[in-house]
């Protein structure tokens, strides 16, 4: 009596069970009664990552250039390219089909946490005592310079953008 | 298309050198670069690759003394500094068979630039 | 570290012979492996390509294989022109070690 169910590793066909191609391989023809399941290599720049009965390899992904993207991690016969982004840029998604820019922290703002390839940089507005003057993606909130320190008075107050200004104390004839 | 290298001479130990590959009928916007050495009677070694983005990567080896970087769109320099005896070698530039990854086969070399350190 | 050992170092044939130069590789790489000839003087020319696959303008003569993490590069009806050294190169990760093998000298009697 033909079967109705295969074994694991195995698929029904014409009332047989028939070996599935190892990954890396796709489906030539199958099994007979006569004959084991032929599979043959995936090529170059294909893979299968399955116990499969495919008759054509997938193609490995593309990791483009022009989007940012660059290889991480090589496909091979049995498993598909990682892509990642290009320094300076990070993955819109999580699959990292494209790359965007690290956002830059605007004056008054410093870097909380700075970017990686999955994630944007995380600012923060800059506490009292704290500033910060440039745009950047690295740069965080930088204290106040501490006029007492070198016996100079403030001058000016500084903000979240600007630094304090230090001078001379005034000095009492 | 062809590829040719200068900038080799004689250097002293602890000098600087900057090696020029100039490329003809090449794409620097689409085609991927590389820099490999040889040293006198020894075998071919990889130094670094630099995409179409401009990214680079290096052998463990050559990270922080060598810089690759593209000058124009015909031109890209092999920067390397703190040179030593062991530098002394062959150097050549050739066109990698991918733009978007570090590790590549080289499918067009130049002739190569010696580079001599010695006091 | 990853190592690429290529073997023998240097081997001798005949003209119209073959001979057979191993690659193997510390590691998987799965089918990213390259092989170059190059003489004396010159820079080195890529022969084959992901283990087997032929560069263009490069006899059939030669021909490229891989079982696992060892690769093979046969050299048949050898000519006096094959005379070079040839050399193997991963390109899968460079992973701390240089992606070319030592080199192997072909020198046809």
């Known amino acids: 009596e033909p079967p109705t169910a295969c074994r694991e590793k195995q698929y029904l066909i014409n009332s047989q069970c028939c070996s599935l191609c190892q990954p890396g391989q796709k489906l030539v023809s199958d099994c007979t009664e006569f004959t084991e399941t032929e599979c043959l290599p995936c090529g170059e720049s294909e893979f299968l990552d399955t116990w499969n009965r495919e008759t054509h390899c997938h193609q490995h992904k593309y990791c483009d250039p022009n989007l940012g993207l660059r290889v991480q991690q090589k496909g091979t016969s049995e498993t598909d390219t990682i892509c990642t982004c290009e320094e300076g840029w990070h993955c819109t998604s999580e699959a990292c089909e494209s790359c965007v820019l690290h956002r830059s922290c605007s004056p008054g703002f410093g870097v909380k946490q700075i970017a990686t390839g999955v994630s944007d940089t995380i600012c923060e507005p800059c506490p009292v005592g704290f500033f910060s003057n440039v745009s950047s993606a690295f740069e965080k909130c930088h204290p106040w310079t501490s006029c007492e320190t070198k016996d100079l008075v403030v001058q000016q107050a500084g903000t979240n953008k600007t630094d304090v200004v230090c001078g001379p104390q005034d000095r009492l004839r | 298309q062809s590829l040719a290298e200068s900038g080799g001479r004689l250097v002293t130990p602890g000098g600087s050198l900057t090696l020029t590959c100039t490329v003809s009928?090449?794409?620097?916007?689409?085609?991927?670069m590389g820099w490999v050495r040889q040293g006198p009677g020894k075998g071919l070694e990889w130094i670094g690759t630099i995409r179409v983005t401009g990214g680079t990567d290096f052998a463990t080896w050559a990270k922080g003394r060598f810089t690759i970087a593209k000058t124009s769109s015909t031109t890209v320099d092999l920067k390397m500094t703190s040179l030593t005896t062991e530098d002394t070698a062959t150097y050549f530039c050739a066109r990698g068979h991918a733009n978007n990854d570090a590790y590549v086969y080289f499918n067009l070399w130049g002739q190569g630039t010696l580079v001599t350190v010695s006091s | 570290a990853f190592e690429l050992t290529q073997t023998p170092a240097s081997v001798e044939a005949g003209v119209g012979g073959t001979v057979t130069i191993k690659c193997q590789a510390s590691q998987s790489i799965d089918r990213y492996l390259a092989w170059y000839q190059q003489k004396p003087g010159q820079p080195p020319k890529l022969l084959m390509a992901a283990a087997a696959n032929l560069a263009s303008g490069v006899p059939s003569r030669f021909k490229g294989s891989r079982s696992g993490t060892e690769f093979t590069l046969t050299i048949s009806d050898l000519e006096c022109a094959d005379g070079a050294t040839y050399y193997c190169?991963?390109?899968?990760?460079?992973?701390?070690?240089?992606?070319f093998g030592g080199g192997t000298e072909v020198v046809v009697k």
């Open positions: 009928g090449i794409d620097l916007s689409t085609d991927g």
């Open positions: 190169q991963s390109y899968f990760t460079s992973d701390d070690g240089n992606t």
